[in-house]
């Protein structure tokens, strides 16, 4: 569900939303750390209705959700939750 990508691309997100999306409607979360052409951290959410949205990393709900996912990943090893793709 939660993925971290290190890319050499510029910023992917033109607009960010802080609107709450319950986890039941989320298919995948992609985290793009700042650097490599983009000065900010970006979070991209793929929803179960096939739409995609960029989420404000400061939104409280996404911070809470990522914490839950991190806890879940640490208790359900060996299934990886963080995937690092180095170009």
């Amino acid at each position: 569900v939660l993925e971290v990508y290190y890319t050499s691309l510029r910023c992917r997100c033109v607009q960010e939303s802080s609107v709450f999306i319950p986890r039941r409607f989320i298919d995948r979360i992609q985290i793009l750390p700042r650097g490599n052409g983009c000065p900010r951290k970006e979070i991209i959410v793929w929803k179960k209705n096939k739409s995609i949205v960029c989420v404000d990393p400061q939104a409280e709900w996404i911070q809470r959700m990522m914490e839950v996912l991190r806890k879940r990943s640490s208790s359900t090893l060996p299934v990886p939750v963080f995937k690092r793709k180095i170009p």
């Epitope: 609107v19 999306i21 039941r24 409607f25 929803k47 709900w61």
Partner: antibody
Framework: EVQLVESGGGLVQPGGSLRLSCAAS????????MSWVRQAPGKGLEWVAT????????YYPDNVKGRFTISRDNAKNSLYLQMNSLRAEDTAVYYC????????????????WGQGTLVTVSS | DIQMTQSPSSLSASVGDRVTITCKAS??????IAWYQQKPGKAPKLLIH???TLQPGVPSRFSGSGSGTDFTFTISSLQPEDFATYYC????????FGGGTKLEIK
Amino acid sequence: EVQLVESGGGLVQPGGSLRLSCAASGFTFSSYAMSWVRQAPGKGLEWVATISDGGSDAYYPDNVKGRFTISRDNAKNSLYLQMNSLRAEDTAVYYCARDYYGSGYEDSPMDYWGQGTLVTVSS
Amino acid sequence: DIQMTQSPSSLSASVGDRVTITCKASQDINKYIAWYQQKPGKAPKLLIHYTSTLQPGVPSRFSGSGSGTDFTFTISSLQPEDFATYYCLQYDNLYTFGGGTKLEIK
């Protein structure tokens, strides 16, 4: 007091269409996602559709995807379910339910439900 | 899709009894389970969400526990008004209801 009142049910032939409505009151309708859940006679509950508070996102299970469309009119405090290509197995009581609070971050499920409207698909 | 296996499907008990209903998820749903009560001809009523959080106004004789895939709903001392059908609902990944448990008077 939260109130949800469904209407629009009735008898329809297989392949036909029907539009259900749900009138909401007693809460800020535009701040909540809304759902439809159905119950076939003598059977259990089955989720049918959910729409986000602003109406921009809709979600469906595979068995109704492409046939049913959920929509809302926040100015009228109303929720709708357009049902096309109806089948005998769509026969059920259809409930409208209040879902998660769109402006929050608590992942809570459907809390208030209407009394339901009966849809019968038969020739 | 996540399946929710609820058991038993029916249960006979007496006023004052302690009653337990279980729901097993086909995969990890964390604590995202809710429990509903439904009486004949009526709409379902939410009793518990997030495994163990009681809705306002719901009596403390109702409780829930579990995490991951195995969940339990308990009525500590049955009251006459508790005879109804109970459903679990997972809301971790879309929505799936359990098949229901009809609680009848012995």
